[in-house]
């Protein structure tokens, strides 16, 4: 089968600081040296790009400086972290992997990770 399978967890709960981490793993049909990883958010039927990074196998994953994502790579596994999440950002986050080089190109799309974000309760004023 000429397809690339991408696995990611079904559900992740963000921390109280609005940080969510998950692993995106892909079964590579070829020997890629250049890989692009994109995190997409699906809300209703709308899909938007959250962040993207291209990396050379064996090198670190580098997102743009203003990105809300960070990540590390190890073989065919990418550890993704999304920061600055709020309750309104709760939704389905899809990991998309593209084997960019050398040919042939392959596309892999995960089933998505449902990230739940709960805004922390404001600390009550305390009298001492």
């Amino acid at each position: 089968c000429k397809a690339m399978h991408v696995a990611q967890p079904a559900v992740v709960l963000a921390s109280s600081r609005g940080i969510a981490s998950f692993v995106c793993e892909y079964a590579s049909p070829g020997k890629a040296t250049e890989v692009r990883v994109t995190v997409l958010r699906q809300a209703d039927s709308q899909v938007t790009e959250v962040c993207a990074a291209t990396y050379m196998m064996g090198n670190e994953l580098t997102f743009l400086d203003d990105s809300i994502c960070t990540g590390t790579s190890s073989g065919n596994q990418v550890n993704l972290t999304i920061q600055g999440l709020r309750a309104m950002d709760t939704g389905l986050y899809i990991c998309k992997v593209e084997l960019m080089y050398p040919p042939p190109y392959y596309l892999g799309i995960g089933n998505g990770t449902q990230i739940y974000v709960i805004d922390p309760e404001p600390c009550p004023d305390s009298d001492f």
Epitope: K2, A3, M4, H5, R36, T38, M100, P104, Y106
Partner: antibody
């Protein structure tokens, strides 16, 4: 709104060159790959080439490899297809099409006609 | 390369009837990477279905896609006058990107 507009088509003699352009608007151009797809008169759709994101990675159909070159200028939101050594069988309507976030060709231009004839 | 074969070549139906179009792949295609397009004379193709079964934005629900592996189907539940056109399937999971040869849905 999201739009792709092709230009540069025309009538050209076999062996000559032509450059097609595809102007994009309404979306973040550098975040998307763009395909060229052609359609010969009365025929079906044939994939020609694709260029990705920053323009470094490109793929071509065997039928045009070595003759066609794709490039993009992300500062101008424009894509180019340089077609050299044109043949009669390259006669077609050429469409540019955006690679949607989930991989399908979700936005298409209206097409530009290339006729290779002596 | 993955070869896509569509059948029938032409489908002659009346408005209100159900249309069933087939697309068969020469090797297994993940359903995530199979699309259907509609093309009317003198116009560019329009994305109808992606991921084998998801409708693109603005596509009416009379269009539906199904299938997996090597066999995929586009169904138009009740043909409207504007649905008479040529339909193409396409795989986009790996290069080279390939299209089927098309099925023409014409008025009977």
């Amino acid at each position: 709104q999201v739009q792709l507009v092709e230009s540069g088509g025309g009538v050209v003699q076999p062996g000559r060159s032509l450059r097609l352009s595809c102007a994009a608007s309404g979306f973040t151009f550098s975040s998307y790959g763009i395909h060229w797809v052609r359609q010969a008169p009365g025929k079906g759709l044939e994939w020609v080439a694709v260029i990705w994101y920053d323009g470094r990675n490109k793929y071509y159909a065997d039928s045009v490899k070595g003759r066609f070159t794709m490039s993009r200028d992300n500062s101008k939101n424009t894509l180019y297809l340089q077609m050299n050594s044109l043949r009669a069988e390259d006669t077609a309507v050429y469409f540019c099409a955006r690679v949607g976030l989930l991989g399908a060709m979700d936005v298409w231009g209206q097409g530009t006609t290339v006729t290779v004839s002596s | 390369e993955i070869v896509l074969t569509q059948s029938p070549g032409t489908l002659s139906l009346s408005p209100g009837e159900r249309a069933t179009l087939s697309c068969r792949a020469s090797q297994s295609v993940s359903s995530s990477y199979l699309a259907w397009y509609q093309q009317k004379p003198g116009q560019a193709p329009r994305l109808l279905i992606y991921g084998a079964s998801s409708r693109a934005t603005g596509i009416p629900d009379r269009f539906s896609g199904s299938g997996s592996g090597t066999d995929f189907t586009l169904t138009i539940s009740r043909l409207e006058p504007e649905d008479f056109a040529v339909y193409y399937c396409q795989q986009y999971g790996s290069s080279p990107w390939t299209f089927g040869q098309g099925t023409k849905v014409e008025i009977k």
